[in-house]
């Protein structure tokens, strides 16, 4: 139950965190003009991975799209590219973990075909968010550099008379969804391989039996036979009982594709 | 069609306060900025304050902080400007204009003018 | 606040001659953003209000006969007039449009000779 939870709670904190890494790669507002201490101008200016958008006082917003891919900076590709990568990778993980899902009967699916699953969609998910916080964190460290860069050469000029006025830009909303998304998603990868876990098959040490041809006694020898574990086996576990002294129920303590919730 | 119609010449003591008004039709008052404008006789124009009726969001020409007070009446789709402890030098023609949308933070249409007189 | 200064300050011409008259501002009204220049020109006739020509700085306002042109970026702005008409004969206001507090340029008159 406690494992079904956990693989649940990470696919729909996953789902979530995705769902946000979308949205940031989507929005416009990455950057934004910065209004601190600076000439307040009628009309703000914002970015996005995609476009710059321009809003005048009459709330008038015009967008015009980076409609070059050579021209552009490389560390806003390498932004584009670990965004695109972790929404990707995180499409892929959801994918898969729809069917490792504990709670949904996929024909004769095993258990351990289903921790497999669950692992793999946990490092989709785990890697998506990395993605994710690494691509806000480099536009980020960009736009901090940016920004003291122009707060440097603020007002440009010729014969030291100001001729302009250059537009510093700060950290806009995208940024903060992108980095909680990736949270996210990240948390949501963890829980997948803690769920792996439970979900599969343990170690267990079950008491094997002996048999003696030779006497009429019946002699029970501890130890010795391990189940059968590891992700890519099929193999069913043998379960060999000390003389019926526990319940079927006592012994299979571990879930298996006949557990529903 | 857009239309700003303001009220008439006003003559007042130093000291005193007027309210200037400013009705609009033609358009959804509630969706576009309003600005204030003085001209003095002979000389050029200059921006006072603009006010967003939607929310009575304003911005004032620091130079007229305290001098000019705008308020909105969106039943009526009207607009005031306050002027108070007014002097010789607040003699002037003020033009109510609406700021048009997607022109440039540009004032579209005017008002005919309000002539503010201060005398003793 | 950004000054704006325009030169002439009048002038005086004849019907059908080509007006070129200035508007210079303190700071450039260029928004990098968009590329657009945030300056604005009115008409203003005698007893009238202003009236909207161009905003930024070049795109003509509907009605506005195409005889005006307006041009320039940065911090220098130029209204022409390719052949003046009686009816053109009224003050020419530039405007910062970009900076808060909104200023204006003290006017060119245009006269009849």
């Known amino acids: 139950m406690a494992v079904t939870a956990c693989q649940g709670l990470g696919f729909v904190v996953s789902l979530i965190g995705i769902a946000g890494i979308i949205a940031a790669t989507c929005m416009d507002q990455w950057s934004t003009q910065d209004l601190y201490n600076n000439p307040v101008t009628a009309v703000f200016n914002y970015q996005g991975l995609w476009r710059s958008c321009v809003r005048e006082s009459s709330g008038f917003t015009e967008c015009r799209g980076y409609f070059t891919l050579l021209g552009l900076p490389a560390m806003l590709q390498a932004v584009r590219a670990l965004m695109i990568v972790g929404i990707v990778l995180g499409a892929i993980g959801l994918l898969v973990s729809i069917f490792a899902l504990k709670c949904i009967r996929i024909g004769s699916m095993e258990d351990s075909a289903k921790a497999n699953m669950t692992l793999t969609s946990g490092i989709m998910f785990i890697v998506s968010g990395l993605c994710a916080i690494a691509g806000v964190s480099v536009f980020a460290n960009m736009l901090v550099t940016n920004f003291w860069m122009s707060t440097a050469n603020m007002y440009t000029g010729m014969g030291g008379m100001v001729q302009t006025v250059q537009t510093r830009y700060t950290f806009g909303a995208a940024l903060f969804v992108g980095w909680v998304a990736g949270g996210l998603t990240l948390i949501g990868g963890v829980m997948m391989c803690i769920a792996c876990r439970g979900l599969a098959p343990e170690e267990t040490n079950y008491k094997a039996v002996s048999y003696h041809a030779s006497g009429h006694s019946v002699a029970y020898k501890p130890g010795g036979f391990k189940a059968s574990t590891g992700f890519g086996s099929n193999t069913k576990n043998k379960k060999i009982y000390d003389g019926g002294a526990r319940t079927e129920d006592e012994v299979q303590s571990y879930p298996s594709k006949h557990d529903y919730v | 069609q857009v239309q700003l119609k303001q009220s008439g010449p006003e003559l007042v003591r130093p000291g005193a306060s007027v309210k200037l008004s400013c009705k609009t039709s033609g358009y959804i008052f509630t969706n576009y900025w309003i600005h204030w404008v003085k001209q003095r006789s002979g000389q050029g124009l200059e921006w006072v304050v603009r006010i967003y009726p939607g929310t009575g969001n304003t911005y004032y020409n620091e130079k007229f902080t305290g001098k000019a007070t705008l308020t909105a009446d969106k039943s009526s789709s009207t607009a005031y400007m306050q002027l108070s402890s007014l002097k010789y030098e607040d003699s002037a023609v003020y033009f109510c204009?609406?700021?048009?949308?997607?022109?440039?933070?540009?004032?579209?249409?005017w008002g005919q003018g309000t002539s503010v007189t201060v005398s003793s | 606040d950004i000054v704006m200064t325009q030169s002439p300050s009048s002038l005086t011409v004849t019907a059908g001659e080509k007006v070129t008259m200035n508007c210079k501002s303190s700071?450039?009204?260029?928004?990098?953003?968009?590329?657009?220049?945030?300056l604005t020109w009115y008409q203003q006739k005698p007893g009238q209000p202003p009236k909207l020509l161009f905003y930024?700085?070049?795109t003509r306002e509907s009605g506005v006969p195409d005889r005006f042109t307006g041009s320039g970026s940065g911090t220098d702005f130029t209204l022409t007039i390719s052949s003046v008409q009686a009816e053109d004969l009224a003050v020419y206001h530039c405007q910062n449009a970009y900076y808060y507090p909104y200023t204006f340029g003290g006017g060119t008159k245009l006269e009849m000779k």
């Open positions: 930024w700085a070049s």
């Open positions: 204009s609406r700021e048009g949308y997607g022109k440039g933070n540009s004032m579209d249409y």
């Open positions: 700071q450039s009204l260029l928004n990098a953003g968009n590329q657009k220049n945030y």
